[in-house]
């Protein structure tokens, strides 16, 4: 069965994630996706109403880090 | 602890303009992935999603009723705003707002029950 | 956007029987599918979240299983404190949606 995410995290780690281990927050579908199943990201085009690239969101990410920008689909952290 | 509490007006008149607030605590909505947004139901009918917001201020909406619907976050103040225009008695509903953070709905609030009639 | 067709919209059942419920999706969601509780006059309460992970402080008696277009919640045994109408909702992609509803009354 899967382990539902976690968010409590130590003073110095990372911000939480809300994948669980193996899966990364997919920005064009909004949920956490198995890792594998992401696509190389596209540039997002200006003015973009809905993120078009198919990305990952890093747990390290920085928030406010654009949705076209890419991402390595690194699996959340516990 | 997460909580969620919608508030606005009880009874609207058809045309008017709708504004509901949902004001949350227990988690901030500028943690990465993290989301809130808003369904409603009608009474004794089925939930239907409106819209919802994102940690990076991306939006999305319900295709049929974008038009007349408007979502925004003040981070600083744990709140998002839904805004709906054009008010019509068939919106009369229950409305609620709710936290996705990864894996869809997952905290509701209690909901708020909103009147259109002249 | 994806239609989920939930059955049946209503069931009645004693106390200790075994409730199932399913959820057709019309199109492959790939277990992103939650099920929720909601009581009279109250708001839903997440139970299952990705088919079949269990919520935080949501009793064993409740399951879920599936996959592909075709998903299942379980109550193992029925207790009078579980009248309520259950709901799924799919999140594989927006606009996320919800199933009609099944009314679960006590014989």
């Known amino acids: 069965m899967r382990r539902g995410p976690r968010s409590l995290r130590g003073r110095d780690a990372p911000a939480p994630t809300p994948c669980v281990p193996a899966e990364c927050f997919d920005l064009l579908v909004r949920h956490c996706v198995a890792c594998g199943l992401l696509r190389t990201p596209r540039p997002k085009p200006a003015g973009a109403s809905s993120p078009a690239p198919r990305t990952a969101l890093q747990p390290q990410e920085s928030v406010g880090a654009g949705a076209g920008e890419a991402a390595l689909p690194l699996p959340g952290l516990l | 602890q997460v909580t969620l509490k919608e508030s606005g007006p009880t009874l609207v008149k058809p045309t008017q303009t709708l504004t509901l607030t949902c004001t949350f605590s227990?988690?901030?909505?500028?943690?990465?992935?993290?989301?809130v947004g808003w369904i409603r139901q009608p009474p004794g009918k089925a939930l239907e999603w409106l819209a919802h917001i994102w940690w990076d201020d991306d939006k999305y909406y319900n295709p049929s009723l974008k038009s007349r619907l408007t979502i925004t976050k003040d981070t600083s103040k744990n709140q998002v705003v839904l805004t709906m225009t054009n008010m019509d008695p068939v919106d009369t509903a229950t409305y609620y707002c709710?936290?996705?953070f990864g894996y869809g709905l997952d905290y509701w609030g209690q909901g708020t029950l909103v009147t259109v009639s002249s | 956007d994806i239609q989920m067709t939930q059955s049946p919209s209503s069931l009645s059942a004693s106390v200790g029987d075994r409730v199932t419920i399913t959820c057709q999706a019309s199109?492959?969601?790939?277990?992103?599918l939650n099920w929720y509780q909601q009581k009279p006059g109250k708001a839903p309460k997440l139970l299952i979240y990705y088919t079949s992970s269990l919520h935080t402080g949501v009793p064993s008696r409740f399951s879920g299983s599936g996959s592909g277009t075709d998903y299942t919640f379980t109550i193992s045994s029925l207790q009078p404190e579980d009248i309520a109408t259950y709901y799924c909702h799919q999140f594989s992609e927006l606009p996320w949606t919800f199933g009609g509803g099944t009314k679960v009354e006590i014989k």
């Open positions: 199109q492959d969601i790939s277990n992103y």
């Open positions: 227990g988690f901030s909505l500028s943690t990465s992935g993290m989301g």
């Open positions: 709710a936290r996705s």
